[in-house]
Interface confidence: low
C-alpha cells in the first residue's frame, strides 16, 4: 500500500523535517532555517515560533518541531502552548485590568496567579473558625463544640491549593 501511495503521490515519501518541493520536481528538500515540518508529506514548512519580548525560549526550534516558549520571571504562561504571558502578582493579590490589587476582605489568594477566592464558610459544615483567614490564606475550620469529645480530630486541614499551572482563564 505504501508503495502504491508513493507512486501516486511522491510527496508522501518526504519525512518530517523536509517539504515536497514543487519547484524542484517534487523532491524532498530540507526545511529552510527557522522553519519546521512535524509530519511527513508536507508541501511547505511552517515558520518557527520566536520567543521574544516577555517570552523566552524553553525549547529551540528544530527541523521537525516548533520552538516552545515560556515567560520571563515575574510572568506566567496562559493559553494553549503558552500563547500569552500574564504578570505575576503577590500572594494576597489578584491581577485586574489596572494591575495587581489586594484581595477584598473575606477573600484570599495563596498563589502568584489566579483570582481571590472566598474564605471557606465553616458554618456550612457545622464547624467553627479555628484560625482566621487572611488575604493570603483560607480560614482553618475546627470542630463544632459538639464534636469536642475525647479522640475526636481537632482540626480539619484546609482545602488543598489549586494545582500549579491552572487558573481561571
Amino acid at each position: 500500500f505504501e508503495r502504491t501511495r508513493s507512486l501516486q503521490d511522491p510527496c508522501s515519501n518526504c519525512p518530517a523535517g523536509t517539504f515536497c518541493d514543487n519547484n524542484r520536481n517534487q523532491i524532498c528538500s530540507p526545511c529552510p532555517p527557522n522553519s519546521f515540518s512535524s509530519a511527513g508529506g508536507q508541501r511547505t514548512c511552517d515558520i518557527c515560533r520566536q520567543c521574544k519580548g516577555v517570552f523566552r525560549t524553553r525549547k529551540e526550534c528544530s527541523s521537525t518541531s516548533n520552538a516552545e516558549c515560556d515567560c520571563t520571571p515575574g510572568f506566567h504562561c496562559l493559553g494553549a502552548g503558552c500563547s500569552m504571558c500574564e504578570q505575576d502578582c503577590k500572594q494576597g493579590q489578584e491581577l485586574t485590568k489596572k494591575g495587581c490589587k489586594d484581595c477584598c476582605f473575606g477573600t484570599f489568594n495563596d498563589q502568584k496567579r489566579g483570582i481571590c477566592r472566598p474564605w471557606t464558610n465553616c458554618s456550612l459544615d457545622g464547624k467553627s473558625v479555628l484560625v482566621n483567614g487572611t488575604k493570603e490564606r483560607d480560614v482553618v475550620c475546627g470542630p463544632s463544640p459538639a464534636d469536642l469529645s475525647p479522640g475526636a480530630s481537632s482540626v480539619t486541614p484546609p482545602a488543598p491549593a489549586r494545582e500549579p499551572g491552572h487558573s481561571p482563564q
Epitope: T44, I47, M84
Partner: nanobody
C-alpha cells in the same frame, strides 16, 4: 496595504452553524500564522483559534474545542472558521488577525479585520 476583510456573520439559532471567511490582501498570506479572535458585548478580547502558515499546526481555545474548525486556503488568500453547535455565549464580533511575524504562534497581532457580528439567539 495589508487588508483583512471578514464575512459570514449573522443571526443563528442555538445549535446552528455558521462559516466565517476572511479575505487577505497586501501581504504574502502563506507566510503568516493567522488567528480568529472574538469580543462578546461588553467583554474583552478572547483568542479563539490559530493556524500556522502551512495549515499543519492548529490550536483552539478550550471554550470552542470540538465545535469550531479553523482552516485556510493559501491559493485563495483566505482564512475560515467553521462554527458548529453554536451557543448563546458564542455571540460576539469575530475578528480575523495576522500574527506578528516576530511572535509567530502567539496571540500577538499586527493587523486586524473590521470584524463580523455573530449573534446566537432563539
Amino acid at each position: 496595504q495589508v487588508q483583512l476583510v471578514e464575512s459570514g456573520g449573522g443571526l443563528v439559532q442555538p445549535g446552528g452553524s455558521l462559516r466565517l471567511s476572511c479575505a487577505a490582501s497586501g501581504f504574502t498570506f502563506s507566510s503568516y500564522w493567522m488567528s480568529w479572535v472574538r469580543q462578546a458585548p461588553g467583554k474583552g478580547l478572547e483568542w479563539v483559534s490559530h493556524i500556522s502558515s502551512s495549515g499543519s499546526t492548529i490550536d483552539y481555545a478550550e471554550s470552542v474545542k470540538g465545535r469550531f474548525t479553523i482552516s485556510r486556503d493559501n491559493a485563495k488568500n483566505s482564512l475560515y472558521l467553521q462554527m458548529n453547535s453554536l451557543r448563546a455565549e458564542d455571540t460576539a464580533v469575530y475578528y480575523c488577525a495576522r500574527e506578528d511575524p516576530r511572535m509567530t504562534g502567539t496571540t500577538d497581532f499586527d493587523y486586524w479585520g473590521q470584524g463580523t457580528l455573530v449573534t446566537v439567539s432563539s
